[in-house]
């Protein structure tokens, strides 16, 4: 239904707190360099304006679109060109081109310092003084570093943050209460960020149809008792919500997500028996809970998939009649039978089925041609299963840090031209798949591993797009989203690469490394490892292990020495010589 004033409508639906939070996220995601205070001022102005429209929908400018209102605010910022360069050119455009222009200027890797968490006492003091401002800072800092973060979900994480601080700041030992809890939220939020970025990439590169296919597969796995019409309705609504968030329409997105959660809770009988616990929660927790609800029990009497999609005499007729619907029912039927497959795998199978029908239905005897299609799925299923087994075995043998190093070597060999910081970030993230997925029950490993790896590789592709340096990476990133992970897995040593010359300063370390937190120490060592591989791309695992063990021993010795500086300056050059010899 059309509303006289869109901004008044959204303010009324969302309430002041969520409205302000979402506007702050929107501004922070568009203009990533502005300070919190600059954005907070804009948010207050927008909120005051929204209130005047609530009071009188006919008031001046209340009928303007949200894009127009928000865009005008952003374009009125002083020194826009000095701070943002060509983004200022967006302000010469009219809507909807102006908003599209803002979206194109979102930076997936902004040059902002890492978000440092203050120490516990200081956090609790500022939280107690002004919880609203404290949470505003959190939203601003996360949103500007993650310009595609799923806005309603960021409100949920802010709420989690709030609850943790409320609880822990009342404790005697604030630090030991806060650290593990906030680390947990941070880890979940980072995973949420890469997953959502993948969804936006799918939407941006391949359109709504591709995202809807993803949603059908995912929802069918989770709700195997829901019929195809119900799954289609949910997938359509979910596609709309994600399209809005990916497009910067955060108020609409949050509002529609709340509507979808409401619909699901009102229609549990036709969706799933597992929703009640989620539906008893307040809004943000409810929507979050529904997004990761456990799979419903699969119906016991599902017929073999072949009946309708291979053996039925009217396969080609049904396909001709309505291709998307027929392929959609195939994806639905296959997915509801396979909660143990990744969505990426299910989409690859659906793509294979579609290609088979395209080819076979044009032949004189289609049934003879497509009759073996399900058997042809086997290699497509075996490949990720082997990937999971091999990698989880390696993870169990090496632990997370060792597993990250193994991946770092592998990926540096595949794409040695990629910058070392990007390779280290990617390997660390890819390596976390072990901790995240390999400890799960067997039937949950594959979907966890592959869908997580796909999201991380999507980030690799986004970073590589900014400065394309590797033909290998370009090749894998140019294909469809679901083919990326198999493409990266299949890459071998890049034979075209000319090894980097050995620079002693790359492997020279100082005593300041000793006081770094464990994570930073690991990154330093992994940076050195990537550089070693760039110097000797064909070094054996044994050679690299020798060098890294020697390096670890050197750090341990010098960091325990009474005169650390002397130890580093005398032993460092010896280490460099030994490294060169070991890799010769």
């Amino acid at each position: 239904e059309a509303h006289k004033s869109e901004i008044a409508h959204r303010y009324n639906d969302l309430g002041e707190q969520h409205f302000k939070g979402l506007v702050l996220i929107a501004f922070s995601q568009y203009l990533q360099k502005c300070s919190y205070d600059e954005h907070a001022k804009l948010v207050q102005e927008v909120t005051d304006f929204a209130k005047t429209c609530v009071a009188d929908e006919s008031a001046a400018n209340c009928d303007k679109s949200l894009h127009t209102l928000f865009g005008d605010k952003l374009c009125a910022i002083p020194n826009l060109r000095e701070n943002y360069g060509e983004l200022a050119d967006c302000c010469t455009k009219q809507e909807p081109e102006r908003n599209e222009c803002f979206l194109q200027h979102k930076d997936d890797n902004p040059s902002l310092p890492p978000f440092e968490r203050p120490e516990a006492e200081a956090m609790c003091t500022s939280f107690k003084e002004n919880p609203t401002t404290f949470m505003g800072h959190y939203l601003h800092e996360v949103a500007r570093r993650h310009p595609y973060f799923y806005a309603p979900e960021l409100l949920y994480y802010a709420e989690q943050y709030n609850e943790i601080l409320t609880q822990c700041c009342a404790e005697a030992d604030k630090e030991s209460c806060l650290t593990p809890k906030l680390d947990g939220v941070k880890e979940k939020a980072l995973v949420s960020s890469v997953r959502q970025r993948m969804k936006c990439s799918s939407m941006q590169k391949f359109g709504e149809r591709a995202f809807k296919a993803w949603a059908v597969a995912r929802l069918s796995q989770t709700f195997p008792n829901a019929d195809f019409a119900e799954i289609t309705k949910l997938a359509t609504d979910l596609t709309k919500v994600n399209k809005e968030c990916c497009h910067g329409d955060l108020l609409e997105c949050a509002d529609d997500r709340a509507e979808l959660a409401k619909y699901m809770c009102e229609n549990q009988a036709t969706i799933s028996s597992k929703l009640q616990t989620c539906c008893d929660k307040p809004l943000l927790k409810k929507a979050h809970c529904l997004s990761e609800v456990e799979h419903d029990t699969m119906p016991a009497d599902l017929p073999a998939i072949a009946a309708d999609f291979v053996e039925d005499q009217e396969v080609c007729k049904n396909y001709a009649e309505a291709k998307d619907v027929f392929l959609g029912t195939f994806l639905y039927e296959y997915s509801r039978r396979h909660p143990d497959y990744s969505v990426s795998l299910l989409l690859r199978l659906a793509k294979k089925y579609e290609a088979t029908l395209e080819k076979c239905c044009a032949e004189a005897n289609p049934p003879a041609c497509y009759g073996t299609v399900l058997a042809e799925f086997q290699p497509l299923v075996e490949e990720p299963k082997n990937l999971v087994k091999t990698n989880c075995d390696l993870y169990e043998k090496l632990g997370e840090y060792g597993f990250q190093n193994a991946i770092l070597v592998r990926y540096t060999q595949k794409a040695p031209q990629v910058s070392t910081p990007t390779l280290v970030e990617a390997a660390r993230n890819l390596g976390r798949v072990g901790t995240k997925c390999c400890t799960l029950p067997e039937d949950q490993r594959l979907p966890c591993v592959e869908d997580y790896l796909s999201a991380i590789l999507n980030r690799v592709c986004l970073l590589h797009e900014k400065t394309p340096v590797s033909e290998h990476v370009t090749k894998c990133c140019s294909g469809s989203l679901v083919e990326r992970r198999p493409c990266f897995s299949a890459l071998t040593v890049d034979e075209t690469y000319v090894p980097k010359e050995f620079k002693a300063e790359t492997f020279t370390f100082h005593s300041d490394i000793c006081t770094l937190p464990e994570k930073e120490k690991q990154i330093k060592k992994q940076t050195a490892l990537a550089e070693l591989v760039k110097h000797k791309p064909k070094a054996t695992a044994e050679q690299l292990k020798t060098v890294m063990d020697d390096f670890a021993q050197f750090l341990d010795t010098c960091c325990k020495a009474a005169d650390k500086d002397t130890c580093f300056s005398t032993e460092g050059p010896n280490l460099v010589t030994r490294c060169k010899d070991a890799l010769a």
């Epitope: 080609c316 007729k317 239905c361 044009a362 004189a364 289609p366 049934p367």
Partner: nanobody, 115 residues
Framework: KVQLLESGGGLVQPGGSLRLSCAAS????????MSWVRQAPGKGLEWVSS????????LYADSVKGRFTISRDNAKTTLYLQMNSLRPEDTAVYYC????????SSRGTLVTVSS
Amino acid sequence: KVQLLESGGGLVQPGGSLRLSCAASGFTFPSFGMSWVRQAPGKGLEWVSSISGSGSDTLYADSVKGRFTISRDNAKTTLYLQMNSLRPEDTAVYYCTIGGSVSKSSRGTLVTVSS
């Protein structure tokens, strides 16, 4: 919506000829193999002939081989069946179908071979 409309049937004497047509709409005609199937009075469906989307490959049931010719005009989205040397046992309702399968999906056209 997929539509298949058969025509060209009628009464013919043994040894005579008929040409059946099937006008197709609602789908990308050249992307699909097409077939003719028939149903004699009181009998089940019987596959007669199939042709690939491009028209390059054709298949025939042994009972009609050498007498019937299947063809298509992709520009006109029409399927044909040229039937020569007709016999009384060819009497049946003839249906055109998508995808080379024996599936009854339209009204058909009646062919009666009788003296």
